[in-house]
Every structure is written in C-alpha cells, then in structure tokens.
C-alpha cells in the first residue's frame, strides 16, 4: 500500500486499467481508503479530474470502477483527485490527494514502418559490411512496458548480399556487389514486437538499394582488328574512319581516351569524340601510294579517370591493330626535274641535240609516256621533242644576238591515261660565238686646227661587238695601212679604246678639207675577227684662243667635239 | 584455326585462263580486318604475290600482273577465286592462298598450294 | 617497287652452329612492315618472324630477327636438324615483295 506524499492518512495501492479490457462493466480498479475511515458508512469517496464519474466512479467504501474500456494508445494515464468527507456534516476528513490511474498497455499495435518508400544508393564493389541505410520501424503500444513495442529486424529477401542488424534495422552488405551484373536489389525487412515471442505482430518494408557506379571496369576494343582506307589525294588532317571501344561502366566512369600506341611512320594520330566515344584515325602526313600503300598501326584505349584505389582494374589497356590500305589516285607523270636548263652553241646546223628531259609514270612503272612541246602561237618553232624519248633538237640555227634564252614548256601524257598530263619548263640558253667583227661604239665627228701641233689629241675612239662581252673581251686598234698615216697616229689605250693624235703640223683647208682614216679594229675571240672602220677628220679654221677655237665651213659653226646651232 | 585449301585444274592450256579457288575453314572469311591473297612460286624459285581481296569485295593486285588478273569472293560458300588470263608457259608454278595477320600484313595462314602447270 | 635481297644464297652450317641470314631492301622500310617465312620441300612457307622481332605462334625461342631501314638480319641462335631449309624475307609496306631465299644447308 502506498501513502500520499503529504503522509495525512490516504492509503492505496498503484492503480491500473489493462486497456481493452472485455470483462463486464463496471470493473474494479483498486481501492482507495484513509486509515481515519472506519467502515461504518460515516465518510464519503468524491472523485473528482480526468474521467471521474464519465469513465471511473469510487463507491463509499472506496473501490474505484471503470465503466468502460480504455485505450492506452488514446491516453496511458489518468490523474484525478480523492476527497473523503464526512457524509453527515460534509466537512473534509483528509486533504484532498491527487493520485494516477494508469492504463496498462497490452500488444494491440503492429510495428509500422512510416517512412517508406525506402530507397538507398550504396556503391558498388564496396567491401562486406559497409552500412547502406538504416529502416526504423514505430510501435503504438508501451515501450517502458513488456515487449509490446520492443522490435526486431530481420531480413525477409535480399540474402546472400544484404543483412540487417536485428535491433538497430541498420541494412549491411555482405558481400561484394558488382553493378555491371545487377544494379537494383530490392530487400524485404521484417520488423516483429514482442521480441519476436509468440503473439507478435510484424510489418514489412521494402528498400531498393541502388548500386551505383565505381571504376572497376577497363575500355575495351569492340574489334581486336580494324581496317581502314586512305586516298593518297587525302589532305593531312583528314579523318579516315573511327574505332570503339565499350566500358561496362556509365557515366564519367565510361569516358574513354584513344592513342597510338605504335606507329613507326608517324603518319596517323588518333583523336577522341567524347560525345560518341569513338577514336577517330586522322591522318597526320600524307601518303604516297608508290612510296607506301600498307600501314599498321596499333590503338589503345584508356579511361579517362581513374582514382588511385581503382587502379588495380587498369592495369594493361586494351589494344586493336588496324590495317589501313593506301588508295592509288592515278597521278600525272612526274618529270625527273622541275625545271631543266640545257644549253647549245649559237649557228649550229638545225638537227642538233640540244639536250633531254625524262618523266616516268610513278602509278606503274611498266606505263610509257609521250613528250611534246606546247607551242605558243606567236612563237616560231625553233625546237622540236622526240615524243619517245624527251629529246629536243634544234629545227633551225639559232642567233644569240637575236635572243640569248629561250623558255619553252614540255609534256608528258600517260599513254595509257590520256587525260594525266605534266608540264616541265626547259629554259635553253644560246652560246656565243665570235661570229660579229667590232666596230666603232658610235659616230665620231672629229676636227683638226690647221695650226695644230705634232701630238696633240684630237680624238679617243671606242669599239663594240655584238657579241657576249666576256670580262676578258678586248679590242686592239691600229692604223690601216694607208697614205694618211704620216699625218695621224693611233695610240691603243690597252683598255678597249684608242687615242687619235697629230703626227705632223701645217694642216691647210685649201690643200685638204677631209682626211679618212682607216682604223682596223682586232677582238680578241676565238677566232679572233677584224674589221676597218673609217675615221672622218675635218681641218678647220681655228681661233687663237684655246678655249675658244672655231671651224669654219659654210653655213655651220664648229667647234671641237661639240656642234652648235 | 583457319585453315585454307586450294583446288582447281592442274593443267591449263596456253592463252587460255587460269581458275582457282580457296575454301577456308575454320574462320569467316568475313572476319573484320582480313585480307585474303593468292601468291605463286615458279619451280625452284622464289614467292611473288598477286593480289588480295577483302571480304567486301575490294581487291588490290601486283602491278605487274594487274592486267591479267582478277580475285572475286563468295562470302556464302567462305571461299574466293583466282582468275588468270591469257597464261603462257612464264605462269607455270604452285599457287598459294593465303590470309593475312592480326597484326600486320604478313602471311600467317597459308594453304598446301596446288601445282598449276601451262602446257598445250 | 621495293627489292629485297638475301645473303648469302646458300649457308653451309653444322647443327648447333648459329645461322644469320640477312635481308636488305632497295629502300628504307620501316622494321614493322617486315617478315620472315620457312620453307621445307613440298610444303607452304610458314609464318616465323614479323614486325621484325615478333615470333609467329609456335615458332621456337631459337629464332629471331632484327633490324631497321634497309638491313635486316633472321638469327637462328642454335641449329637443330629440322631448320635445314630455306628462308624468305617479306616486306609488306610497299605491296608485297618476297627475297629470292636464303638456303641454309648441312655442312
């Protein structure tokens, strides 16, 4: 029995209500008494607070009833407040007692799960034991009381690769998963009050446990052989097909980068579309058919991130060999030079060989070519090919002086292709011969004083030949053998010009008006040539002044070297 | 393993054509990246190729033959052919066929060759 | 076209002697587009050596190759009686062109 805090003479013991109690109403509850109450009908039991009267009820002698069945879930706890009073003068015996009706629970609620759908993600390959989620299931009766509410978990489906910790509903992986083979289990998770004893009541919950993805799968070539083809026409740059590899795994995870990884020609590189995954082969050089036609190369494919802890899944990149074929583009003949220079000696006799020009078709060796010259309209034809053999001849004699170059343009047209046709410019150059004798550079008008001393100079002459002037090319002057000669001599300079002086004195226009001097004039060629040049010398009258020295005759007003109106 | 057999006569007349064919076996002769050639040996002497086909029908001949020759290919019987025109005496000579590599363009099957002789 | 040449034609060896044989080309090629074959009497050649150095399936350690640009070189390192035969070089960048063979025989 218990006493009031206030130790004034209440007595009770706990009081309880088994909720959902069945039994015949009213039921008995407990009984509450002042030990000042002497069971002779004297005093009086008011109830008075939660319920009192609507659900319990006390009689005189103190036992409290209930009239109806409660529910613990609604409320687990009454409290109300005894008075004991004597009946007759209404005067209270005992201070008034707060005191609690409790409501015991019994197991009339099933565990439930509130916070499904359950989905988890966990990632793959992750070691046994890794924690994935964790589902918590309520119960409506007492957790303080008996087993009502105290719950287990345990695992309905998802065995052998998820467990669940009984008390904690903590779902483990017990082994490792791989996402390529399953990516979605769905777990089943009981949870069972009463600790799993008899008269339990259970709920499920379903969890879908997603496995996400991790690195733990290498690229690998759709095809351990590729074969491509490449035009030798193709520029470089160009692509010339795609390669592909596939990666069981998704995402950032499934990024792939292709390279080469042997190519001793260096011709090709590979480049990754990482929109389509694919390798592209670009060619890096371009390719001659006739230097090469077959190449291989090797490709290998790698991702594009791998952390550290991965690497182990790495290891050896996968490889695929590609065969990749040169297209034959039938190309013009090529011409052993681009440009040929030839020359031949000036005046020959039409017919000679002035030199040859070869071209070969690199397309197939056994393909012969046919020459000719593109001949331009206004052009005389000075030269003609042999359209077997490229060699060119001359069709007339040629004249340095007249040109000392000529440019002309050859052919070469596949016979068995008509249409390819290549172009070589032939510049031939003529060489001199000594076929032009010299001669004066110019008109010489040339005046003598009729007082003129012996010696004095009375003209420098010059030569020219038109022919090449080598750095060596000289002329020697003299006199002709003639009558003048003791009149004038000739003074060689030994640098290709001569000086005329006075050999004698007393010149006289009476007695001679003109002297013709005969200069021979010798190059130095091969055969050397001559020729007589006739050198005009007018005596005139002169002033004595020698600045100012005048030849008079007729109409014109001569002065020495210069002429004036 | 692949494996290769030549067949066709034996003897052929001057001027007229050569035909061989190849069965393989043991392999598609669709393989992806695989060429199919025929190659000769003149008695006592050395090998000289003569052409390839690839399964889709392109082909590449010796420059020097290519006027004469022509390699076709049946995918359905996995077999391809060998035609040689206008044979004289110089085509004499066993006849091989071949499949190139899985990494590179070197012979790595071959069949037993069969002996082609041009007589009249 | 790319001519290759064998040296020397014919070599005279004993059995366990190493044999080198060597292949020149008229031309540089680059050393993985080259191969070299058996061939015994009566039979196909048969694959040995390509890239140079790579060893065809099966082919004994006994074999192997080397070289680069235009020289080339087949070693057999120990000479064991099967290997009396003759050998062709094979450059596959150019078309196809064989050497005219090698015969290794028993002196």
């Known amino acids: 029995d218990y006493k009031d805090d206030d130790d004034k003479g209440w007595v009770w013991e706990p009081l309880f209500v088994t909720e959902e109690e069945t039994s015949t109403m009213p039921m008995y509850v407990g009984q509450l008494k002042s030990d000042l109450d002497k069971e002779d009908g004297s005093l009086q039991y008011i109830l008075t607070g939660e319920g009192a009267d609507s659900i319990f009820f006390i009689n005189e002698h103190g036992k409290i009833y209930v009239r109806q069945k409660l529910d613990r879930e609604k409320k687990s706890f009454y409290i109300l407040r005894a008075q004991v009073i004597n009946r007759k003068t209404r005067h209270p015996i005992e201070p008034d007692s707060e005191f609690i009706i409790k409501v015991r629970d019994i197991n009339d609620h099933e565990p439930q799960f509130l916070d499904g759908p359950y989905v988890a993600t966990v990632p793959e390959m992750s070691p046994e034991g890794t924690s994935v989620t964790q589902v918590t299931a309520t119960d409506g009766d007492d957790p303080s009381y008996g087993n009502n509410a105290r719950l287990l978990y345990s695992l309905i489906q998802g065995q052998p690769y998820f467990s669940v910790e009984p008390k904690t509903g903590v779902i483990r992986m017990t082994s490792q998963m791989d996402r390529e083979t399953k990516d979605q289990y769905l777990v089943v998770i009981q949870a069972k009050d009463m600790v799993g004893q008899a008269g339990a009541f259970s709920a499920t919950a379903t969890v879908t446990i997603n496995l996400s993805d991790v690195n733990d799968n290498k690229p690998i070539f759709k095809e351990s052989l590729y074969r491509l083809t490449v035009s030798e026409s193709a520029p470089t740059g160009t692509s010339i097909g795609t390669i592909m590899a596939y990666d069981n795994d998704i995402g950032e995870n499934a990024e792939m980068d292709y390279s080469i990884e042997e190519d001793d020609s260096q011709t090709f590189d590979i480049i990754t579309n990482h929109e389509t995954q694919e390798g592209i082969v670009i060619l890096k050089k371009k390719v001659d058919f006739e230097h090469q036609n077959h190449y291989g190369i090797r490709a290998k494919v790698k991702n594009h991130h791998v952390p550290e802890q991965l690497m182990k899944y790495h290891t050896e990149a996968s490889t695929t060999f590609i065969k990749i074929q040169v297209e034959d583009v039938d190309e013009p003949p090529v011409f052993t030079l681009e440009s040929y220079v030839m020359e031949i000696a000036e005046g020959v006799v039409s017919g000679s060989l002035v030199g040859t020009v070869s071209a070969r078709d690199l397309d197939n060796d056994d393909s012969s070519v046919r020459y000719s010259i593109v001949q331009g309209l206004h052009l005389k034809r000075l030269f003609s090919i042999n359209e077997h053999n490229g060699t060119i001849i001359t069709t007339e004699p040629l004249d340095r002086e007249k040109a000392s170059w000529h440019n002309i343009t050859v052919t070469a047209t596949e016979t068995r292709n008509p249409e390819k046709i290549s172009e070589a410019n032939v510049y031939i150059q003529v060489l001199d011969v000594n076929d032009h004798a010299p001669e004066f550079s110019k008109y010489y008008e040339t005046f003598v004083c009729e007082n003129a001393v012996p010696g004095q100079l009375i003209q420098n002459i010059s030569a020219v030949d038109k022919d090449d002037s080598a750095e060596n090319h000289r002329f020697y002057f003299s006199l002709a053998q003639a009558t003048n000669s003791s009149h004038f001599t000739v003074k060689d300079n030994q640098d290709n010009t001569a000086g005329i002086f006075t050999a004698g004195s007393g010149f006289s226009r009476k007695e001679q008006f003109y002297f013709f001097l005969p200069i021979l004039i010798l190059d130095n060629g091969s055969p050397p040539l001559t020729s007589t040049n006739t050198l005009t010398v007018t005596v005139c009258d002169c002033d004595t002044e020698v600045n100012t020295l005048y030849c008079r005759y007729g109409a014109f007003l001569y002065s020495i070297g210069l002429s004036t109106e | 393993q692949v494996q290769l057999q030549e067949s066709g006569p034996g003897l052929v007349k001057p001027s007229q054509t050569l035909s061989l064919t190849c069965t393989v076996s043991?392999?598609?002769?669709?393989?992806?990246?695989?060429?199919w050639s025929w190659i000769r040996q003149h008695p006592g002497k050395g090998l000289e190729w003569i052409g390839y086909?690839?399964?889709?029908?392109?082909?590449y001949y010796n420059p020097s033959l290519k006027s004469r020759v022509t390699i076709s290919v049946d995918t359905s019987k996995n077999q391809f052919s060998l035609k040689l025109s206008s044979v004289t005496a110089a085509d004499t000579a066993v006849y091989y066929c071949?499949?190139?590599?899985?990494?590179?363009?070197?012979?790595?099957?071959w069949g037993q060759g069969t002996l082609v002789t041009v007589s009249s | 076209e790319i001519v290759l040449t064998q040296s020397p034609g014919t070599l005279s060896l004993s059995p366990g002697e190493r044999a080198t044989l060597s292949c020149r080309a008229s031309r540089n090629i680059s050393s993985s587009y080259l191969a070299w074959y058996q061939q015994k009497p009566g039979q196909a050649p048969r694959l040995l050596i390509y890239?140079?150095?790579s060893r065809a399936t099966g082919i004994p350690d006994r074999f192997s190759g080397s070289g680069s640009g235009t020289d080339f070189t087949l070693t057999i390192s120990r000479l064991e009686p099967e290997d009396f035969t003759v050998y062709y070089c094979?450059?596959?960048?150019?078309?196809?062109?064989f050497g005219p063979g090698t015969k290794v025989d028993i002196k």
């Open positions: 890239g140079p150095s």
């Open positions: 071949a499949r190139d590599g899985s990494s590179g363009w070197y012979f790595q099957y």
């Open positions: 086909i690839y399964y889709t029908g392109s082909a």
């Open positions: 043991g392999g598609s002769i669709s393989s992806s990246g695989y060429y």
């Open positions: 094979q450059q596959y960048g150019s078309s196809f062109t």
